[in-house]
Structures are given as C-alpha cells and as structure tokens.
Interface confidence: low
Amino acid sequence: FNISGCSTKKLLWAYSTRSEEEFILFCDLPEPQKSHFCHRSQLSPTQVPDHLPFTDSKDLPDVQWYRQPSNGDPLEDIRKSYPHIIQDKCTLRFLTPGVNNTGSYICRPKMIKSPYDVACCVKMILEVKPQSNASCENSASHKQDLLLGSTGSISCPSLSCQSDAQSPEVTWYKNGKLLSMTRSNRIVVDEVYIYHQGTYVCDYTQSDTASSWTVRAVVQVRTIVGDTKLKPDILDPVESTLEVELGKPLTISCKARFGFERVFNPVMKWYIKDADLEWEVSVPEAKSIKSTLKDEIIERNIILEKVTQRDLRRTFVCFVQNSIGNTTQSVQLKEKRGSGGLNDIFEAQKIEWHETVRFQSHHHHHH
C-alpha cells in the first residue's frame, strides 16, 4: 500500500545502559467512529488523539505493523522478522533497547472498512540512541516502586534530572490511556493503591532548528507493601508425628508463608537427623503455590520411595528462612498399628538392608 499519505511522527528513545528497559509505540489512529477523520494534519496540536492499546473493547480494530527498510525494500511484517518486538493490539512493544531498533514503523487498520481508510496509517520514525554521558547519568529508574497506602511519585526517567520548574510539558499515559490531569515531569500520588501499578509512558517534545521530536520513556510501576518484619511461618506439616505404613511410599509436604521482601530470597529445605548425624536431602524444587501482594506460599516435598524401620528412628526437618530469620518443623514417623502382616515386616527388613548400603555409600553429603 502507498505510505506517502500516512501521517508522520518522529520519536526519540534515549535508552539507559543501566537497565533492560522497554519501549512502546502507539498506533495513533483515531477511534473507529472517527475513522474518516484520519489525517493527523487535520488535528490541532492540542487535540491529542485517543490511544487504543490495552483496552478490552471488542469493536476496536486491530492494526497491522510494518517496518520500512532504509534501503527502499518492500515493507517488512514485524511479527515475522523481529522476535524482540511484540505486537499487542494497537501497540508495538520493544523488549530490548539498542540502536538497531532505529527505523520507520508503519501501522494501519487490519480491516479497511471504507475508501477513506486506505490512507489511514501512521508512520513513526524512531531514533534510538544510548543516553550520552554528558546527559544526566542519575536519572530515575525505568522500574519504580510505590508503597501502598503512602504518598509517592512517578518520575519521567528522561526528565528526572531537571527541576519541575524547568521541565517541559509532559504527556503521560498509563497502560496506553492518556492521563490528561498531569503535565509535569512527575506524577504525584497522594495515596498509593494497587491500581497505580502498570506501564507508564511519558512524552515531551524536543525541537531543534530542523525538526521536532517526541522524546519518550517507559516506566514499569510496581505497587508494593513494606518489607515484612516477620520470619516465615510453616503452615504444613502441623503435627510433629505422622503415622506411616512400612514398605509404602510416602510424601511429606512442607508449606510455608513468606512475607513480602523487596529482595526476595526464600530458603526452603529438608534435612534429616539420625542420632548425632544431620544432612540435607536432595528433594524436588520448591514451587510457589500462592502469591499475593503481601505474601507468598511456597511448597517443597520430601519423597520416600518406601518407608523403612530406619526412617522410624529419624527426624525429618523442614527448614525455611528469609532475611529476618528461620523457622523449622520436625516430623517423626510412627508406624501405623495393625497395618501389615509378617510379609510386610520381612519386606521392610529387606528394604532397610538395601537402604543402609545406599545410605552408607552416599553419606559424604552429611553436614
């Protein structure tokens, strides 16, 4: 299709070498009901077009994205050629920064509903460059935390070195929606709620003698609770003794709740005490079974192929730890009475003999 009729927008992505930041292009097409009103030249500078991304509305048109090669080759379909660029409804998400993202990107509706729509397209000329050393090195992070229930602010990384007074007018978007109430280089939040979490985009215009560019930065905002002041608590096992059948397989599950921590390094392991010996057991990886804003429940199982007489003399200990401290829960196995006959006991003794040999040959693992 002929792209000469597309409205054109110039964007600059000055990426920080410090973080693996993302970048977003919006397809600035008007809403479907305004689709005849397609050429950006007819919009006054104050009429900011409504962005379409991140909405659930069923009647919004999906768009097709292309990249225009600099050598004049035919337009390339983004999805086929660029795996690090994700098309998400009406946005284009760049997962990794780099000057190789520099180029022209074109979007247009997938479904052409009227003759007017043929020329309904937007061409975005994107220039990507690393932040120069001369510019501010201590800019705001592209990942920012807001503490729930407190006041906070979200800073535009490309402008955070400037005072509010000298900052240009900024256009903010949250999850693709225009935030019309704020025009400064930071958004002040009086009280932080979960809904403040999301992807924020800040734009401002930079002009030189030749042309004007939109400088854009993307900020991932996370709402968090304060770091826990508690060590983890073990939810399961509750009882310190467990009735078992000799010769049968057994799984003992350890479940523990860990409070939120900014740097989260949970430790969960099983170890065995046998007389004066103690060693850690190699067990399947721990897995998160429930995660909320305030805490996370993690489970790790110890699996015995067959319970032996020796196991009845051992203590199985689940150990959990966070940065505050650790908690343990011990479990002693107890044979179920009247559960098996003579054959079971002979079988259990045979297993115990094999297990003793295995135990002795692997015993260099003990602490």
Epitope: R18, S141, L147
Partner: antibody, heavy 124, light 107 residues
Framework: QVQLQESGPGLVKPSETLSLTCTVS????????WSWIRQPPGKGLEWIGY???????NYNPSLKSRVTISVDTSKNQFSLKLSSVTAADTAVYYC??????????????????WGQGTTVTVSS | AIQLTQSPSSLSASVGDRVTITCRAS??????LAWYQQKPGKAPKLLIY???SLESGVPSRFSGSGSGTDFTLTISSLQPEDFATYYC?????????FGQGTRLEIK
C-alpha cells in the same frame, strides 16, 4: 544531577548517640531507597541499613539494636542515629542512593550515587 | 550473612598491564554483584553491576564476569587514574555485604 551531602557532628563521646543527616539535592527523595554505609579508618565498607521514602527500613543485624534510620520527605533528607557508640564506631559515614536494576530475570539494587562522606570520631 | 572474599588483597602493577581481581561468595548470589572503585579520601564509585554490566560513563577497559559464587573484575590496560582500592558487593540477600577490598598500587 542528584547529589548527596552528609552533615552532623564530627566528634561524639562514648555511650552517646551519633546523629547524621543526608540531604538529597537535584532530585526527589521519593521513589528511591537510601542507604547508610560506613568505613572505619583503613578498613573496608560496612552497610548499615536502608530506608524507603515511605519509611520502610532494613538494618544490618550486627547493628540493628542500635540503629534508627528515618526520612523527612518534605526536607528531602534522611537521617541516621546510632546509639551507645564506642571507639569501634569511629568511621567515615556515607549516604547513598539505591537504584533499581532490571537484571537477568531479577530485580535488585546497587548504590549509584554516594555522598562524599563525613568523618565521625568517637572519643572522650 | 554472605561473605565475599577478594583476592589478592593488594597487588602492584604498571601502566598498560592487564589486571584481574577475583571475588568469591560464600554461597550462590546469581549475578547480583557490583564492583566499586574507591580513591583515598573519596566515596566509592560504581563501575560494574549485575556482575558484567558496565555503568554509564565508566571506561570500557573495565569489565566484569562470573555468576553464582565466582566473579572477576578485569582492567584490560591499566591507566594512571586506575590505581585505587576495588570492592565487590552483593545485593542478593540481606545484609548487603562488601568484599574486604583489593588495593591496586603502582609498581
């Protein structure tokens, strides 16, 4: 450009409380974590603790019983109090900003901006 | 607490030399390791974060590598301004800890 400046008395008597303030200029204290670090003469660096602009703190267990870090967002300052000091607390005390790093599938913090440090001597 | 052990504690080298400093963690810390440079009477300066990422404005002769427990800082060609003390720091778990430092002197 964000700059940090430590201030407070350079001499503190044993058993008294050491009080230092770090003033953040050229940027807002909001949305960042802020740490205190110290360095005894001729020795290495020891992390004391951090504070989030909202007041959430985390302290080094070795000093926890004696440390309080507080923040005053209206003044763009955060402060350190260390009680019951002894000669072993003589050190250069630094304040620093912890900046979030989106690293290989994780999210952690490094100290990218530091104050120039202030020397505190504990002596009678 | 995670202990970080740097080696050597001090070394002498000449301008133009290639220098390697190692840092060993007492337990695995993934890539959550940073390197700092400190000159006498000055605050530490961030050089490397995430074990191998170069901080903005730091010369490319500095590089970092490693993951888990063993890490290295390499200066490919020493310059006069590189003579200083270097510290590694882990931010994998609390408390945050630093290595004891490596003093780099002019031979």
């Amino acid at each position: 450009q964000v700059q940090l400046q430590e201030s407070g008395p350079g001499l503190v008597k044993p058993s008294e409380t050491l009080s230092l303030t770090c003033t953040v200029s050229g940027g807002s204290i909001n949305n960042y974590y802020w740490s205190w670090i110290r360095q005894p003469p001729g020795k290495g660096l020891e992390w004391i603790g951090y504070i989030f602009y909202s007041g959430t703190t985390n302290y080094n267990p070795s000093l926890k019983s004696r440390v309080t870090i507080s923040v005053d967002t209206s003044k763009n300052q955060f402060s350190l109090k260390l009680s019951s000091v002894t000669a072993a607390d003589t050190a250069v005390y630094y304040c620093a900003r912890d900046v979030g790093i989106a690293a290989r599938n994780s999210y952690y913090y490094v100290m990218d901006v530091w104050g120039q440090g202030t020397t505190v001597t504990v002596s009678s | 607490a995670i202990q970080l052990t740097q080696s050597p504690s001090s070394l002498s080298a000449s301008v133009g030399d290639r220098v390697t400093i190692t840092c060993r963690a007492s337990q695995g810390i993934s890539s959550a390791l940073a390197w700092y440079q400190q000159k006498p009477g000055k605050a530490p300066k961030l050089l490397i974060y995430d074990a191998s990422s170069l901080e903005s404005g730091v010369p490319s002769r500095f590089s970092g590598s490693g993951s888990g427990t063993d890490f290295t800082l390499t200066i490919s060609s020493l310059q006069p301004e590189d003579f200083a003390t270097y510290y590694c720091q882990q931010f994998n778990s609390y408390p945050i800890t630093f290595g004891q430092g490596t003093r780099l002197e002019i031979k």
